[in-house]
Interface confidence: low
């Protein structure tokens, strides 16, 4: 990989746990200023594999609320608006980073955590297992 | 909201920037142990709105590598395996948290950042605008 020279203005790293424990500024910088203006908020309803969104709340986590997608049907919606069970609605999952308060209930001490969330659903051709 | 009593064993928060700056343990805890064993890695190919995955690398970001989905077609794949342009393949986007080194090139100082990533694609019915 590329070796980047260390910035001489970095904070002191005398912490005995360094480099496991780092300082993080929670003032979130949002890099999404140039996002596509096309509204994607209604894809959950217009998709051939539509989904509902469920609220997952955990006050010990940052962010404390995450919305999870759950596919509405096992099959996919066909051109007639009916569920076609020859196809499958499946969740698209992504691993995301969150901060977990550690020790619990501490306002300024966290641990990084990876969680798997379902972001939406897609329609796939099923894998058919033929019995010999 | 729920008020949770502060844990008396919390680290000291005398930092003048508190509560904006917090301590974070980078030893990632992975909560995905009970994930569904069904592999979703091939959905990108089996979907009626298939996608390709592109590598986005940034050594100043944690995680440094993020995979971005790009829909292969404007339309969706029909039962005959052809692209049907009466439907649209659209990206499902998710806002995720990442850590950005701040000041740059510092190993132990970060800022939280929100970025928008495309996780996969779904097939939607297009919005048709009728001209009067």
């Amino acid at each position: 990989g590329i070796t980047i020279p260390r910035n001489p203005g970095c904070p002191n790293s005398e912490d005995k746990n360094f480099p496991r424990t780092v300082m993080v500024n929670l003032n979130i910088h949002n890099r999404n200023t140039n996002t596509n203006p096309k509204r994607s908020s209604d894809y959950y309803n217009r998709s051939t594999s539509p989904w509902n969104l469920h609220r997952n709340e955990d006050p010990e986590r940052y962010p404390s609320v995450i919305w999870e997608a759950k596919c509405r049907h096992l099959g996919c919606i066909n051109a007639d608006g009916n569920v076609d069970y020859h196809m499958n609605s499946v969740p698209i999952q992504q691993e995301i980073l969150v901060l977990r308060r550690e020790p619990p209930h501490c306002p300024n001490s966290f641990r990084l955590e990876k969680i798997l969330v379902s972001v939406g659903c897609t329609c796939v051709t099923p894998i058919v297992h033929h019995v010999a | 909201g729920i008020t949770i009593p502060r844990n008396p064993g919390c680290p000291n928060s005398e930092d003048k920037n508190f509560p904006r700056t917090v301590m974070v343990n980078l030893n990632i805890h992975n909560r995905n142990t009970n994930t569904n064993p069904k592999r979703s890695s091939d959905y990108y190919n089996r979907s009626t709105s298939p996608w390709n995955l592109h590598r986005n690398e940034d050594p100043e970001r944690y995680p440094s590598v993020i995979w971005e989905a790009k829909c292969r077609h404007l339309g969706c794949i029909n039962a005959d395996g052809n692209v049907d342009y009466h439907m649209n393949s659209v990206p499902i986007q998710q806002e995720i948290l990442v850590l950005r080194r701040e000041p740059p090139h510092c190993p132990n100082s970060f800022r939280l950042e929100k970025i928008l990533v495309s996780v996969g694609c779904t097939c939607v019915t297009p919005i048709v605008h009728h001209v009067a």
């Epitope: 908020s41 962010p63 999870e68 | 998710q94 806002e95």
Partner: nanobody, 119 residues
């Protein structure tokens, strides 16, 4: 810090009316589209209404068209939802939300206000 605080929910009889309010702070309210979103007990999330930055355009889900009206007062950093002709199926927690809605982190959402329609 972005804050969205809803109020105005409550118990109302079928056919009745309620006006929900959302007080916004921590961001430039007039720069964002705003939304009302609801979640019925045991159900998924449903987008109810959207209003553009200057209030010139409003959009509604079919089930509330002609009954609900979304409005905003940029001078007061406030969003409103006037609900008339309420039905049992309108029972839900109503959230106000900021900006482009993606089912993501909760930076964009309020804590919600419960609307119960029952005789």
């Amino acid at each position: 810090e972005v804050q969205l605080v809803e109020s105005g929910g409550g118990l109302v009889q079928p056919g009745g009316s309620l006006r929900l309010s959302c007080a916004a702070s921590g961001f430039t309210f007039s720069s964002y589209s705003m939304y009302w979103v609801r979640q019925a007990p045991g159900k998924g999330l449903e987008w109810v209404a959207e209003i553009k930055q200057d209030g010139s355009e409003q959009y509604y889900v079919d089930s509330v068209k002609g009954r609900f009206t979304i409005s905003r007062d940029n001078a007061k950093n406030s969003l409103y939802l006037q609900m008339n002709g309420l039905r049992a199926e309108d029972t839900a927690v109503y959230y106000c939300a900021k900006g482009e809605i993606l089912p993501l982190y909760f930076d964009y959402w309020g804590q919600g206000t419960l609307v119960t329609v029952s005789s």
